[in-house]
Every structure is written in structure tokens, then in C-alpha cells.
């Protein structure tokens, strides 16, 4: 016959915002100022992140959650928890090691971050260019050239649905 004893860790009763204080008979003590514990049963509280310099405080640290930072305007966050700040560019530009550079012809970027991407190739979908692309905007594809031939109806019926991998009959 086997006796089992359930030995519950007294620290498991300590809620978030406290720590299990070994120096005080494992009593649950509140996290000291500028520290937090986001889960129960912790034996230490974590030091709050300080958003210094160009890192601005987006959310203050509390006893149960860390501070959250963002970047001063002109830069944006990168990395887990905004570990880095990266400079913004204007629309129509991308960031390079030489700073912000205009998108090359045939590419665009409609955001302050990210890279220039190629304009959509309308002809791949059998369509024509309705509105030309710019450095800031993609092209707008319109009806196929055949639909715009003289005598063709100005209202084009939708193309029949087809399964992937099958050519239209």
C-alpha cells in the first residue's frame, strides 16, 4: 500500500504582483517599486523596463505588467517589445544604409517604413493598366485589352470561376 502526500508549494498561492519572500517564511510580499510579476508563484519580481531617451513610455509599469515603450516621432519600433527604433522615410522611399532613398522606377512604397515593391504586372492577369503607378502608389489594373476593343461591351461579365491548375476551356 502506497501513501501519497500532496505537498503544495506555498509559493504557488502568491498572485501576480507579489513574490514569494524566502526571507519572510515564504510570505507573499508585494513587488517593490519599479518591479513587477506578471504571473503567480514567482520567487522574484522583474525590474521594470525604463523607456529612456528616444524610447518613450507608451504604458507605465504596474505591479503586474512591464512598461511598454515606443519610439519618438520620426522613428518607429522594431523587434520584440520595441527593442529597436528605426527611422521613418517618406512614402515613395525606402530605408537603406545611406538613409532614405526614392523608390526606383517600377517600384512603390505607400508607407513610412518597409521596402519599395514592384508595381503589379497587370498583364499577368490578362488586364490592362488603368492608372499608372508612382513611387507612392501601385498601378491600378483595369479590364483586359480585349474588353476595350471597339465594339466590345462596356460592361464585362465576370470571368467564369475555375479550379486552380485548370486552364479555361
Amino acid at each position: 500500500f502506497e501513501r501519497t502526500r500532496s505537498l503544495q508549494d506555498p509559493c504557488s498561492n502568491c498572485p501576480a504582483g507579489t513574490f514569494c519572500d524566502n526571507n519572510r517564511n515564504q510570505i507573499c510580499s508585494p513587488c517593490p517599486p519599479n518591479s513587477f510579476s506578471s504571473a503567480g508563484g514567482q520567487r522574484t519580481c522583474d525590474i521594470c523596463r525604463q523607456c529612456k531617451g528616444v524610447f518613450r513610455t507608451r504604458k507605465e509599469c504596474s505591479s503586474t505588467s512591464n512598461a511598454e515603450c515606443d519610439c519618438t516621432p520620426g522613428f518607429h519600433c522594431l523587434g520584440a517589445g520595441c527593442s529597436m527604433c528605426e527611422q521613418d522615410c517618406k512614402q515613395g522611399q525606402e530605408l537603406t544604409k545611406k538613409g532614405c532613398k526614392d523608390c526606383c522606377f517600377g517600384t512603390f512604397n505607400d508607407q513610412k517604413r518597409g521596402i519599395c515593391r514592384p508595381w503589379t504586372n497587370c498583364s499577368l492577369d490578362g488586364k490592362s493598366v488603368l492608372v499608372n503607378g508612382t513611387k507612392e502608389r501601385d498601378v491600378v489594373c483595369g479590364p483586359s485589352p480585349a474588353d476595350l476593343s471597339p465594339g466590345a461591351s462596356s460592361v464585362t461579365p465576370p470571368a467564369p470561376a475555375r479550379e486552380p491548375g485548370h486552364s479555361p476551356q
Partner: nanobody, 123 residues
Framework: EVQLVESGGGLVQPGGSLRLSCAAS????????MNWVRQAPGKELEWVAN????????YYVDSVKGRFTISRDNAKNSLFLQMNSLRADDTAVYYC????FGYGDSHYGMDVWGQGTTVTVSS
Amino acid sequence: EVQLVESGGGLVQPGGSLRLSCAASGFNFSNYWMNWVRQAPGKELEWVANINQDGSEKYYVDSVKGRFTISRDNAKNSLFLQMNSLRADDTAVYYCARGGFGYGDSHYGMDVWGQGTTVTVSS
């Protein structure tokens, strides 16, 4: 502790010069690109210049080209910005920042920043 500490800021007359320094500690300085970034009063943060690990590549924002020179001394874990022909619109807090290139192909994030040094250009 990873740290960057700027110095050398101050009040200077238009047309004058200043040399900013940035002392790095707590990391292998020679492994990183380094940057100068500034924030003028009431303006957004603006990248000024960067320099690669061995100092062979240097790039500048258009507004400072020909006037500012970025350099580094890896033996002394130091970054510098020589600022000549200073103008009123150069007035700003100048930050030294680690990174800027070499983290990956798609971004130029700067992860370690100094506290900044203030440059005021006024007569």
C-alpha cells in the same frame, strides 16, 4: 552594462565648429555600425550620419553633407561627429546610437542610445 555617453555639445555661433564624442562601453564596439541622430526643438527625430565597423563606409543626410564628418576610434571605443559651418537649424539634441545596419537585410533598427548632448547654434 551596455552604454553610450555623448559629450561635446554647447553653445556656438553660426559658422562655428563643434566636435561631439560618444564613449561606448559594455559591448564589442568594433562589431557594430554606429549612428548620430538628432532632434531639433519641436521636430521629429532625424538620422544624421552613420559609419560602418571599420570606418570605411560613411553616409550622411543631405542637409549636413560637406559640413559634418563622422569618425570612430575602435581602440578607444569612441565615435565622433565633427561639425563645421554650423547653422541655426543644426540646433538639436544629438544622440549616438548603436546598430543601423548589420541586423539583417530588411531593417536598420538602432537598439542602444545615449542620453544625448545639446548643441545650440545662436549669435
